[in-house]
């Protein structure tokens, strides 16, 4: 079958309250079929390629296990299998100033070099 | 051929801890997400958690991870699961399990035995 | 977490017979289901994964199907080691979750 191109699927918006727990779902397809060599799954806030990270985890060739690297106030959880082209990440104890735009990118590395992030991120509403 | 050799059973007070251990052996070890799978008597099964040998690197289910310690030694590749303030309901079999990969896609390729531990006072 | 459902929870089929177990997500998993037998004090055995794909030495007589939510395991014609109990797993979230499980009989 011909190789997928790089896309990453976002809802808009994802609404939820102060003091709960919202998740922001992110999945993506890309052209590097069978791939399983090292990975890098990050979210962050504000703006694309740019705004501060919130979320970062890498994972070793061969492994699914995505190990956290940051994980801004210990508030952020991926759900997602990035193997299995899902970022999906959990926020929880939602705070007012978590009201903005999220982006998730993954990278992958060793014998493939290729990255890819979400342009328009989803908006993540805390009322 | 791969074969991953898990120790016997044990019988625990609650309040005690367990540690079980799984000897991996016909693959290269640090390779490998090693999963642990426990099975309640006459229940299904559930997923407690990983380790990626290469790296030490850990993931866990949040329903254990205050009581859960996966770790593994390299040098004898064998993988362990310590559970801690064991309960009744922890009377359980414990399983290892190797994370296989085939172009792409990761399965549950070799299971141990399976450890029984129960937990009684 | 996802909870994954099965249906039935047991299936009683005459040898030579079509067994079907049906697997239901809480939520999309994509194509991200494995599929395991058991029998009686022995450990799980890998029979499909990636929702279709059958491993290594399985027989061809066990087939899945499925995406998103809705999954199938069948057995196009039952022999006599097939029973056991089957369960299903996704592994698209994490923690990774199993059906409760289907138990396989001889009618």
């Known amino acids: 079958s011909p190789a997928q191109r790089w896309s990453m699927q976002v809802p808009p918006e994802v609404s939820a309250e102060a003091g709960d727990a919202a998740v922001l779902p992110c999945t993506f397809t890309h052209p590097h079929r069978h791939y399983d060599g090292p990975l890098t799954a990050i979210w962050r806030a504000g703006e694309p390629y740019a705004g501060p990270q919130v979320f970062r985890c890498a994972a070793a060739r061969g492994s699914e296990l995505c190990q956290t690297a940051l994980s801004l106030h210990g508030r952020f959880r991926l759900l997602g299998n990035p193997r299995r082209n899902d970022l999906s990440l959990r926020v929880e104890r939602l705070a007012l100033a978590d009201d903005r735009r999220y982006f998730c990118r993954v990278e992958f590395a060793g014998d493939v070099h290729d990255r890819y992030e979400s342009r328009h991120g989803v908006r993540l509403h805390v009322t | 051929q791969v074969q991953l050799v898990q120790s016997g059973a044990e019988v625990k007070k609650p309040g005690a801890s367990v540690k079980v251990s799984c000897k991996a052996s016909?693959?290269?070890?640090?390779?490998?997400?090693v999963s642990w799978v426990r099975q309640a008597p006459g229940q299904g099964l559930e997923w407690m958690g990983v380790?990626?040998?290469?790296?030490?690197?850990?993931g866990y289910n949040e329903k254990f991870k205050a009581r859960v310690t996966i770790t593994v030694d390299t040098s004898t590749s064998t993988a362990y699961m310590e559970l801690s303030s064991l309960r009744s309901e922890d009377t359980a079999v414990y399983y290892c399990?190797?994370?296989?990969?085939?172009?792409?896609?990761?399965?549950?390729?070799?299971w141990g035995q399976g450890t029984l531990v129960t937990v009684s006072s | 977490d996802i909870v994954m459902t099965q249906s039935p929870d047991s299936l009683a089929v005459s040898l030579g017979e079509r067994a079907t177990i049906n697997c239901k997500a809480s939520q999309n998993v994509g194509s991200n289901v494995d599929w395991y037998q058991q029998k009686p004090g022995q450990p799980p055995k890998l029979l499909i994964y990636?929702?279709?794909n059958r491993y290594t030495g399985v027989p061809d007589r066990f087939s899945g199907s499925g995406s998103g939510t809705d999954f199938t395991l069948t057995i196009s014609s039952l022999q006599a080691e097939d029973v056991a109990v089957y369960y299903c797993m996704q592994s698209n979230f994490f923690p990774f979750t199993f059906g409760q499980g289907t138990k396989v009989e001889i009618k």
């Open positions: 016909g693959y290269t070890f640090p390779r490998y997400d």
């Open positions: 380790i990626h040998p290469g790296s030490g690197g850990t």
């Open positions: 399990a190797r994370r296989g990969l085939n172009k792409g896609y990761w399965f549950f390729d070799f």
């Open positions: 990636e929702s279709t």
